[in-house]
């Protein structure tokens, strides 16, 4: 039961996390105008990964997309790439984990296959979360660097006569959404990996199997065979017989051709 709960919770947490990563990637408020030096501005600037926006005194907001690829800073391109990779990995991870869920029965899928898929999706979620956290952190670092650079040249004036306040940017809501979402995806991935250990058949008990050698009647009853990881082990040529009743979370043997869902 604990394995099912851990796997299910991991899936839900990852789902929320990936939804958050998608939301953060699409959000316009990655960086927002710092109002510390100009709290009375009637024009509020904010920027996302894909476009920059200006909210005017009328309440009207105008957004302009970055219609260039080559003209954009390499760091911004890197952040975009990290977020997209995070989303793609997360989406694939979600797809894989749906089939890996213990509560969902698909055909005669073996438990080792489900364990495999759970681990795969878990790793994908971990990498997806790390990509998101890395992307957001790179952008945040870029903001901090630019903030202090623009603070150093805060005022660019015409012969010192006219003061032109340079627009400085600070952390936008998307950064916090991204960090939290990345963290959730990471946690979800770890939970999936933990669940995978419970799903894997740690110990496969063989029932008495008679091997009839020619001329002799010898009954061979082997002891418990320790599977190395529970998945990926060579189960070819192993004849495994289904034991009696078992609970949902107990180690399941591979279903025979007569085990239908």
């Amino acid at each position: 039961m604990a394995v099912t709960a851990c796997q299910g919770l991991g899936f839900v947490v990852s789902l929320i996390g990936i939804a958050g990563i998608i939301a953060a990637t699409c959000m316009d408020q990655w960086s927002t105008q710092d109002l510390y030096n100009n709290p009375v501005t009637a024009v509020f600037n904010y920027q996302g990964l894909w476009r920059s926006c200006v909210r005017e005194s009328s309440g009207f907001t105008e957004c302009r997309g970055y219609f260039t690829l080559l003209g954009l800073p390499a760091m911004l391109q890197a952040v975009r790439a990290l977020m997209i990779v995070g989303i793609v990995l997360g989406a694939i991870g979600l797809l894989v984990s749906i089939f890996a869920l213990k509560c969902i029965r698909i055909g005669s899928m073996e438990d080792s296959a489900k364990a495999n898929m759970t681990l795969t999706s878990g790793i994908m979620f971990i990498v997806s979360g790390l990509c998101a956290i890395a992307g957001v952190s790179v952008f945040a670092n870029m903001l901090v660097t630019n903030f202090w650079m623009s603070t150093a040249n805060m005022y660019t004036g015409m012969g010192g006569m006219v003061q032109t306040v340079q627009t400085r940017y600070t952390f936008g809501a998307a950064l916090f959404v991204g960090w939290v979402a990345g963290g959730l995806t990471l946690i979800g991935g770890v939970m999936m990996c933990i669940a995978c250990r419970g799903l894997a058949p740690e110990e496969t008990n063989y029932k008495a199997v008679s091997y009839h050698a020619s001329g002799h009647s010898v009954a061979y009853k082997p002891g418990g065979f320790k599977a190395s990881t529970g998945f990926g082990s060579n189960t070819k040529n192993k004849k495994i017989y289904d034991g009696g009743a078992r609970t949902e979370d107990e180690v399941q043997s591979y279903p025979s051709k007569h085990d239908y869902v």
């Epitope: 105008q33 100009n38 009375v40 501005t41 009637a42 024009v43 600037n45 920027q47 920059s52 200006v54 005017e56 005194s57 009328s58 309440g59 009207f60 105008e62 302009r64 006219v162 003061q163 032109t164 306040v165 340079q166 627009t167």
Partner: antibody, heavy 115, light 113 residues
């Protein structure tokens, strides 16, 4: 086409309060701020402040902070401005305006303060 | 507060001529976020509310004749009327749309010679 219809002229006693309205039509009321502007022959045009009908937020010119109160009723798409403790200096035409670059203005409400 | 200074305070013109009026702000109205200047020009005739002519220093509002041209950047702005008509006789105001409180110039009155 956006349109702002302001309430009629007011003749009020000194020390009293007056509340004028600005009925909006032809645009999404919650999408734009409604600004209020005072015009007197001596002082010219003065910005009083704005109300944001979408979230109820407002911003005032400090000169009018204790004088004017801006509100909005989204149900009736109407913005209101109340001016309190009226003096002769408050005798003016008050406009409401909205849209990009204040593209739309009400016809104005003339407030006359009598002694 | 940003102080808006308009000059001249009045202009006497004859129909058909070109007119320029100036507006100067005490602080820059330039927004580096979108590289635009937040200055507005209005025309006001007696008994009427101000009418928007130009916003963002140079963007003509819809329906405004192309004889009205806004220019300038930072702190110095100009409104040019290339071919003055009789209906253009009015008071012209500039407004800071960049920083609160929004402030207006005292106006330039266009009068017939």
């Amino acid at each position: 086409q956006a349109y702002l219809q302001q309430s009629g002229a007011e003749l009020v006693r000194s020390g009293a309060s007056v509340k004028m309205s600005c009925k909006a039509s032809g645009f999404t009321f919650t999408s734009y701020n409604i600004h209020w502007v005072k015009q007197t022959p001596g002082q010219g045009l003065e910005w009083i402040g704005y109300i944001s009908p979408g979230n109820g937020g407002s911003n005032y010119n400090l000169n009018f902070k204790d004088k004017a109160t801006l509100t909005a009723a989204t149900s009736s798409t109407t913005a209101y401005m109340q001016i309190s403790s009226l003096t002769s200096e408050d005798s003016a035409v008050y406009f409401c305006a909205t849209g990009r670059g204040f593209a739309y203005w009400g016809q104005g409400t003339l407030v006359t303060v009598s002694a | 507060d940003i102080v808006m200074t308009q000059s001249p305070s009045s202009l006497t013109v004859t129909p058909g001529e070109k007119v320029t009026m100036s507006c100067r702000s005490s602080q820059s109205l330039f927004n580096s976020g979108n590289q635009k200047n937040y200055l507005i020009w209005y025309q006001q005739k007696p008994g009427q509310p101000p009418k928007l002519l130009i916003y963002r220093a140079s963007t003509r509002d819809s329906g405004v004749p192309d004889r009205f041209t806004g220019s300038g950047s930072g702190t110095d702005f100009t409104l040019t009327i290339s071919n003055v008509q009789a209906e253009d006789l009015a008071v012209y105001y500039c407004q800071n749309d960049y920083s609160y409180p929004l402030t207006f110039g005292a106006g330039t009155k266009l009068e017939l010679k």
